[in-house]
């Protein structure tokens, strides 16, 4: 959970000839306020959709009258944020609409009357618990000048809100496989719970209750192969039921990215690699100087000082892209180990271990004996994340509580009878028949076969087996 | 913090080859996984040859047979032997580490080193 906050500087005449007209006059004074709509990364820009992420509406503006003669300057704006809660995870990629609506305050009857000014949409990549990303749109001869950013509520923390973050239970350290939360190092992570039932191999989470698949796995658990063999065309939604990519148009088709930008496919839709002065999800903002800070994750930003002159972003290691948007594949280096899952959080590397191991690299191989002991004497033997006790004699069982029947399994040779004892069992062996189990047959001449009697001992005397 | 400095680029010929070293400096750290990431003008960074954090090498598809990874612990240094080089070898070429300090992991990058293939 976290909140989304929108911050307009300013709501003006854009550069460039054919400057608006006031919006007020001094027979209708009227004031300002916004509305934002805010939708997961991939979803249409239609204003009419549901605002799924969540909208928010500013408190009205001073009150303005145009004074005659006077071009329209910037619009006073209302104080504070504009602020828009979201439940679940931040997802990293987002499409908003800001509407800039005018109150006209004349005599009307019925009350004031409301008009749409300007709207602008666009589509964002931000990561939570950054800082202040500061953008320009356009909206005919209008230009609205805003910052926005995303944070975290506690306890979550992370670039999507999905890390939870609990009081350390004891001083000294937090659980196995859970790291502190920087930068509350007294806090520790909170176990990342996916939906019950979700594949530990093909499926993972990066919130409470979720399965997602991973390339090549279908269903709601990722539990299914997909399997493109009696399919068609090898690319469309895939169908839950049959695990087939069911045919449909590709992501690239038709070139979604504007202004020259290249599109390839990625596994749940596409991304646009961008020329130099263009970003967002299509490449479709333009005009942007190094003032507006187009470089994200911390690039810098070099040249660029008007709208006709390309910026470059300088990205930080480990960001790519022409605003420093795309982060490497850092997981393509094998970091964890034992079989673990890696995921890219962006903030950092997460290993999902596989049952049996942990750690931050699922290093460590479970002490699966700690906790565990075995009974009457047995010793526990751990191995693939399972334990198992190695019973005394006399003893079995998986925790060696049960008494053995150290006869139950026949072991006297040759007609032996044999007999349970405390340290073990005693054959009594039959008339010619000699050793711990009868094993060697006693030779007419009174000599046995190997090994020889004990001295002590007399052929069909009872053996006992320590 | 850990410091990673490879050498080793420069202007080579299709076919020739050229050895690239990154040599890991720092206090009380330990190297997980480590290898050479690449990138070319206008193009992604990717993974060109590592050990991962079991020890094991691993190649992408397009140096295989070509480039061969190795390391030195003492020196906590890896190398990359690069033979039959191409054209489409051009690019900066980065040494990357994920790298155990205490109890936590960090991922390092170096600054690249240029290397260019060209007649």
């Known amino acids: 959970a976290g909140v989304f906050e929108l911050q307009i500087h300013s709501f003006g005449p854009g550069p460039g000839p054919g400057a608006p007209r006031s919006p007020c006059s001094a027979r209708l004074p009227c004031r300002l306020f916004f509305r934002v709509c805010l939708k997961p990364g991939l979803s249409e820009e239609a204003a009419e959709s549901p605002c799924a992420l969540g909208a928010a509406l500013s408190a009205r503006g001073p009150v303005y009258t145009e004074q005659p003669g006077a071009p329209a300057p910037d619009l006073p704006l209302p104080d504070g944020l504009l602020q828009v809660p979201f439940r679940d995870a931040w997802p990293g990629t987002f499409s908003f609409i800001i509407e800039t609506w005018r109150e006209e305050l004349g005599d009307q009857i019925g009350g004031p009357a409301w008009s749409l000014l300007a709207r602008v949409a666009g589509r964002r990549r931000l990561a939570a618990g950054g800082p202040w990303a500061r953008d320009i749109q356009r909206a005919g001869a209008w230009e609205l000048r805003f910052s926005y950013r995303a944070r975290c509520e506690p306890p979550a923390v992370g670039t999507a809100c999905t890390r939870l973050c609990r009081p350390r239970s004891a001083p000294s350290r937090c659980g196995p496989g859970l790291r502190p939360c920087a930068p509350l190092e007294d806090e520790c992570e909170a176990p990342l719970v996916c939906r019950a039932g979700c594949s530990p191999e093909h499926g993972f989470c990066e919130q409470p209750g979720e399965c997602r698949c991973l390339e090549g796995w279908t269903g709601p658990l990722c539990t299914v192969p997909v399997s493109t063999s009696s399919c068609l065309s090898p690319r469309g939604p895939s169908s839950a039921t049959t695990g087939c990519l069911v045919p449909g148009p590709g992501p690239c088709d038709g070139n979604p990215c504007a202004n020259g930008g290249s599109c390839s496919e990625t596994p749940r839709s596409f991304e646009c690699t961008c020329p130099r002065g263009f970003y967002g999800l299509r490449c479709e903002v333009s005009g942007v100087t190094c003032a507006d800070g187009p470089c994200f994750n911390g690039g810098l930003c070099v040249g660029g000082a008007d709208p006709d002159s390309a910026y470059i972003c300088h990205c930080p290691p480990g960001f790519q892209g022409s605003n420093c948007e795309k982060r490497v594949d850092r997981c393509s280096l094998q970091p964890c180990r034992n079989g673990g899952l890696c995921l890219d959080l962006g903030h950092a590397l997460r290993c999902r271990c596989r049952a049996g191991f942990a750690g931050p690299r699922c290093e460590h191989d479970l002490d699966d004996c700690a906790g565990r002991a075995c009974a009457n004497g047995g010793t526990c033997v751990e191995g693939g994340g399972a334990h198992r006790c190695s019973c005394a004699l006399g003893f079995g069982g998986r925790d060696c509580r049960e008494r053995a029947d150290p006869c139950a399994a026949r072991p006297c040779a040759h007609g032996g009878r044999c007999y349970a004892h405390f340290s073990g069992l005693v054959c009594a062996c039959a008339p010619g028949y000699m050793g711990a189990r009868c094993e060697f047959p006693v030779h007419p001449d009174g000599a046995s076969a190997l090994p020889a009697a004990p001295p002590g001992l007399r052929p069909g005397d009872p053996q006992r087996y320590l | 913090e850990v410091q990673l400095v490879e050498s080793g680029g420069g202007e080579v010929q299709p076919g020739g080859s050229l050895r690239l070293s990154c040599a890991a400096s720092?206090?009380?750290?330990?190297?997980?996984?480590i290898g050479w990431y690449r990138q070319a003008p206008g193009k992604q960074r990717d993974m060109v040859a590592g050990f991962t954090g079991e020890g094991v090498t691993t190649y992408a598809e397009s140096v295989k047979g070509r480039f061969t990874i190795s390391r030195d612990n003492a020196k906590n240094t890896v190398y990359l032997q690069m033979s039959s080089l191409r054209a489409e070898d051009t690019a900066v070429y980065y040494c990357a580490a994920d790298v155990k300090i205490g109890g936590d992991y960090e991922w390092f990058w170096g600054q690249g080193t240029l290397v260019t293939v060209k007649p």
């Open positions: 720092g206090s009380d750290f330990s190297i997980n996984a």
